[in-house]
Interface confidence: low
């Protein structure tokens, strides 16, 4: 038992619909015989139905947890003694227990049950960016870009809206980019302009609101 | 190995009705579970589907005639089939979804079918 011995956190955090990588480092007796290849699995605790289906693993012949599959990787080799976790488009019910199990047919099998990983979902508290290059002029056409600089790139892309209660530019009340372009108008002045960005793979949006400062160039005539 | 075991078809009158069962052996649990049907010479269809909590999904076709339910604790699958049409005739297939992937193919379990025939 000496010999089996995996380092990792005790406890990661991450927020729903973004991604946490947990580096992890596996150790198992070496047996000079020939063996086949080890294979490692990622595991969740306590699971009733289908104890035995990792939530990731590094066999091809393996069943996986549909409800993981895609957004759990065993990024690291276990051959290489990594047992390195990536999670995407993380959800609330992620949130559970997890424990690695190394295979090398036909001898060992070890499920590292006293290294447990301690994974917590919380909800996602952040908020996109709305970025206004300048001042909005009446009349002049301006890109207005919704971003959200903390979601990371290997999730699954999320879905941007605009909403507005009165933009007379807007053609229709949404628009599918990250990019608004529009032309704002003086009545368009105090307008709350609302981006919207939804996070698919777990579910979830967020959403940022500001008041449009619309100014006039000297000269321009009040309607 | 997880095995599905199909009863309740036959031959019925239009107009009559027919119970159809599906039960699993083998231990699996199951998330969501459905009914599909082939008449000879078209291709599967979906009947009617129902998740682990109990919401339902029926075809249109279907809809007010046949109502799908499950035994959670049994394991089993029932479709209760009211006001037969000649139409309905077709190979009965159960479908169980246990929530698994394979090579990050979803794993399905199929029944071998049941036989149903409305004719007078």
């Known amino acids: 038992d000496l010999e089996f011995q995996l380092v990792a956190p005790e406890s990661v955090t991450v927020e729903e619909g973004l991604c946490v990588h947990v580096p992890c480092s596996v150790f198992y007796p070496s047996i000079k015989l020939t063996l086949g290849p080890v294979t490692g699995s990622w595991l969740r605790k306590g699971v009733s139905l289908h104890e035995d289906s990792p939530v990731a693993t590094s066999d091809p012949r393996q069943l996986v947890q549909k409800a993981t599959q895609g957004r759990f990787q065993l990024l690291g080799d276990p051959q290489k003694h990594d047992c390195s976790l990536f999670i995407r488009d993380a959800q609330k019910n992620d949130t559970g227990m997890y424990f690695f199990r190394v295979v090398r047919e036909p001898f060992v099998r070890y499920s590292y049950k006293k290294s447990q990983l301690s994974l917590h979902v919380t909800s996602l508290s952040r908020t996109p960016d709305i970025i206004i290059p300048g001042t909005l002029e009446a009349g002049y056409p301006s890109n207005l870009t919704c971003s959200v600089p903390w979601a990371c790139e290997q999730g699954t892309p999320p879905t941007f809206s605009w909403m507005s209660t009165a933009l007379t530019s807007l053609s229709s009340r949404t628009t599918d980019s990250s990019v608004l372009t529009f032309t704002p108008q003086p009545q368009d002045h105090g307008t709350k302009l609302t981006c919207l960005v939804t996070f698919s793979g777990a579910g979830v949006t967020v959403e940022r609101t500001i008041q449009l400062n619309v100014t006039r160039k000297s000269g321009q005539m009040r309607e | 190995e997880v095995q599905l075991v199909e009863s309740g078809g036959g031959l019925v009158q239009p107009g009559g009705s027919l119970r159809l069962s599906c039960a699993a052996s083998?231990?699996?649990?199951?998330?969501?579970a459905a009914w599909y049907r082939q008449a000879p010479g078209k291709q599967r269809e979906l009947v009617a589907s129902i998740s682990y909590g109990g919401s339902t999904n029926y075809a249109d076709r279907v809809a007010g005639r046949f109502t799908i339910s499950r035994d959670n604790a049994k394991n089993s699958l029932y479709l209760q089939m009211n006001s037969l049409r000649a139409e309905d005739t077709a190979v009965y297939y159960c479908?169980?979804?246990?929530?698994?992937?394979?090579?990050?193919?979803?794993?399905?379990?199929w029944g071998q079918g049941t036989m149903v025939t409305v004719s007078s």
């Open positions: 083998g231990g699996t649990f199951v998330i969501n």
């Open positions: 479908r169980l979804d246990p929530g698994l992937a394979l090579n990050n193919r979803p794993l399905y379990y």
